[in-house]
């Protein structure tokens, strides 16, 4: 730790005196003190000397000497009083700015320690302090107002009793700022605006803060608008409101509007978009494909997005067939408003039944007219399979009919033994039918295909299996010839098991 000479914590001198403060350390040393200097500073080897040939009250203060090379940052200090009978106070700053609930140091330094007993803090022109002002005094530092409040923003003077009379310091202005948590809070309404040319419109930009010192403005496409500001104070907050009223909007009023507010903590801004249109509009769209395929028994939500101005006058879901004349239950139709001009309408179709395949249409109406959006719903079914034995053109033929959606593929298997289903070990032959004959293929219905397998001789200890599959699943039918010589007998003499 550096050493100061003279080796005293406090030094009292008279005005005009020569004062020399020497600091010595192991390495280089540095003096520091009040920001206002009034000293000559020079180095002398390993010491640093602070000197004045003519001390004045302005030299009153605490001077600290540090050793920059000391990792512990040790320092030594000395407080100098220059006791001037005419100047009991050395005021280091005439304006002090703090935030509410901080301690505010009013830096009036007493120039004579003897005067400490008779000091007091007053407001200018001899006015007493406000009630509940809690303060303390240090001759080295000045008066501290503890946990300063906004209302204590005043001009103060430090008072000392000298020879029975009060001598005042120059005034110190205290500014207590409200603690501003951040930039002002903002609202810009509406969040989005659409108007038909010639209609009226209003945009309101408002900002609020605990402190009155903030600015707010409304700009249109980066141009600041000159709008009269309304100010208010309620709920302990200052409010500033800008209202833009447009009696008859035109296309030049369209664009981006930004509400911007700023204070010492920074800036907040929020934006909205104003669209001006020639006439009413109504647009229907869906993020879904309008052609839907769902497995029977599963559920589906049909969603339609509506963009409209002016607002909708009516809307509904309609089932257009082809199966029944049932209509969607109102409780299954749901509407949500995303914002003023956009809505989402949902039709929930849980556990779909075969009779619910078909066309579903959403219809909406506003002053711009009617619009409709139609979904086509096809149900997917796993294949159902049946096999019969018949003669075609005199040849014994196994006939397999498979019905499902999407269109099933057909594969024939011949395997040894009698079985409900051929497994790999038993398979003797496999035939793929790449082009089965389509028997029926109507919209929203199952597709039925037929595959023929010509068999010269039905082997009696074997099984013939027709397998059909599609993206939903698979189905099969095993045909088991029972009597020998079946190849000569008509199919009704044969037994088969599904």
């Amino acid at each position: 730790i550096p050493v100061i000479e003279p080796s005293v914590p406090e030094l009292v001198v008279k005005p005009g005196a020569t004062v020399t403060l020497r600091c010595v350390g192991n390495g280089s040393v540095e003096w520091d003190g009040p920001p206002s200097p009034h000293w000559t500073l020079y180095s002398d080897g390993s010491s640093s000397i602070l000197s004045t040939n003519n001390a004045t009250f302005q030299n009153t203060g605490t001077y600290r000497c540090t050793e920059p090379g000391d990792p512990l940052g040790g320092s030594a200090a000395i407080h100098l009083y220059v006791k001037d009978p005419a100047r009991p106070w050395n005021v280091l700053a005439q304006e002090v700015v703090v935030f509410e609930d901080q301690d505010a140091l009013l830096p009036c330094l007493l120039t004579d320690p003897v005067l400490e007993a008779g000091v007091s803090l007053v407001r200018v022109r001899g006015r007493p302090l406000m009630r509940h002002t809690n303060y303390s005094f240090s001759p080295w530092h000045g008066f501290t107002i503890h946990r300063a409040k906004f209302i204590q923003s005043q001009d103060y003077q430090c008072s000392a009793l000298m020879g029975g009379r009060k001598v005042m310091s120059i005034s110190i202005r205290l500014k207590v700022q409200k603690v501003i948590p951040g930039p002002p809070a903002l609202t810009l309404v509406p969040a989005e605006l659409v108007r038909i040319r010639g209609e009226a419109a209003q945009i309101v930009c408002s900002a609020s803060s605990v402190d009155v010192n903030f600015d707010v403005f409304l700009q249109h496409n980066n141009t600041k608008l000159a709008i009269p500001q309304q100010s208010d104070f309620h709920n302990n907050r200052y409010q500033k409101v800008l209202t833009l009223n447009l009696d008859q909007v035109d296309f030049q009023h369209a664009g981006n509007y930004s509400c911007v507010a700023s204070n010492v903590q920074g800036k907040h801004s929020t934006s909205m978009f104003f669209r001006v249109v020639e006439s009413a509009y109504l647009n229907l769209s869906s993020e879904q494909n309008l052609i839907q395929e769902v497995t029977v028994g599963e559920g589906l939500n049909l969603k339609v997005m509506v963009e409209a101005y002016p607002g909708l006058q009516g809307f509904n879901w309609t089932y257009l067939g082809p199966f029944s004349d049932h209509q969607p239950e109102p409780k299954l139709a749901n509407a949500t408003t995303k914002d003023t001009y956009r809505h989402t309408f949902t039709l929930s179709l849980p556990r779909l039944k075969p009779s619910e395949a078909g066309r579903y249409s959403f219809l909406a109406r506003n002053p711009g007219g009617w619009r409709a959006l139609t979904f086509e719903l096809t149900l997917r079914y796993p294949p159902e399979v049946s096999v019969i034995w018949t003669f075609i053109n005199g040849s014994g033929t196994l006939l397999c009919a498979a019905s499902g959606y999407p269109q099933p593929n057909v594969t024939w298997l011949q395997c040894s033994g009698h079985t409900d289903r051929c497994d790999e070990a038993q398979v003797l032959q496999v035939w793929d039918d790449p082009y089965p004959e389509v028997l029926s293929q109507e919209p929203f219905h199952k597709v039925t295909v037929q595959s023929l397998l010509t068999v010269e001789t039905l082997e009696h200890n074997q099984t013939y299996e027709c397998r059909a599959h599609n993206s939903v699943g698979s189905g099969s039918w095993a045909f088991i010839p029972i009597s020998a010589g079946a190849h000569t007998h008509p199919p009704d003499e044969f037994l088969f098991t599904p």
Epitope: D32, P37, L41, Y42, T66
Partner: antibody, heavy 117, light 110 residues
């Protein structure tokens, strides 16, 4: 070794806010005043204000009072200069410097602030 | 308009001695010490002289300062090309309660 390292150059639009920083190292940050000095393009140096990080005592030049805010965070030995709403006339080089008995003994490298629409 | 007055430019040839003046008033140079700063292009300012005539360590003794009344001057002897820079004088001002600067002098080494 005493060092003051300032944040990088900034380009802003009028009306925007800004906070530039100055990190001190190599000395006892709480025991020395830190000042901010402005140099406008082609002009001289102007003192803006000083802060004593030890107790946040802050003094402003009358020309800059209310225009800027000087603050410090002793936990990260950093001083700050901030504007809530920049103007084109704030375009300048800003220096931080350690202040001692009326002079600035160590300076930061400077932060160039450009304000243009 | 700067509080302290300096000539806008000065010049000299290598090896020569040049002097830069700085004038103020009783509230600054008249009652407080003078400091000088050097600004080399593209670098941070550097303290050259403090307390009228004191040189921080690392500053060559070619640089010297003096003060008399409300004026001060910076002298550079044995001028070198690396001395080409802007030089600013400064002093504490009691009425401002802060430091004031001169307008700066651009030194050219011919």
């Amino acid at each position: 070794e005493v060092q003051l390292v300032q944040s990088g150059a900034e380009v802003k639009k009028p009306g925007e806010s800004l906070k530039i920083s100055c990190k001190g190292s190599g000395y006892s940050f709480t025991n020395y005043w830190i000042g901010w000095v402005r140099q406008m393009p082609g002009k001289g140096l102007e003192w803006m204000g000083i802060i004593y990080p030890g107790d946040s005592d802050t003094r402003y030049s009358p020309s800059f009072q209310g225009q800027v805010t000087i603050s410090a965070d002793i936990s990260i030995t950093t001083a700050y200069l901030q504007w809530s709403s920049l103007k084109a006339s704030d375009t300048a080089m800003y220096y931080c410097a350690r202040h001692r008995l009326g002079f600035f003994d160590y300076w930061g490298q400077g932060t160039l602030v450009t304000v243009s629409s | 308009q700067s509080v302290l007055t300096q000539p806008p430019s000065a010049s000299g040839t290598p090896g020569q001695r040049v002097t830069i003046s700085c004038s103020g008033s009783s509230s600054n140079i008249g009652s407080n010490t003078v400091n000088w700063y050097q600004l080399l292009p593209g670098t941070a300012p550097k303290l050259l002289i403090y307390s009228n005539n004191q040189r921080p360590s690392g500053v060559p003794d070619r640089f010297s300062g003096s003060q008399s009344g409300t004026s001060a001057s910076l002298a550079i002897s044995g001028l070198q090309s690396e001395d080409e820079a802007d030089y600013y004088c400064a002093a504490w001002d009691d009425s401002l309660n802060g430091p004031v600067f001169g307008g700066g002098t651009k030194l050219t080494v011919l």
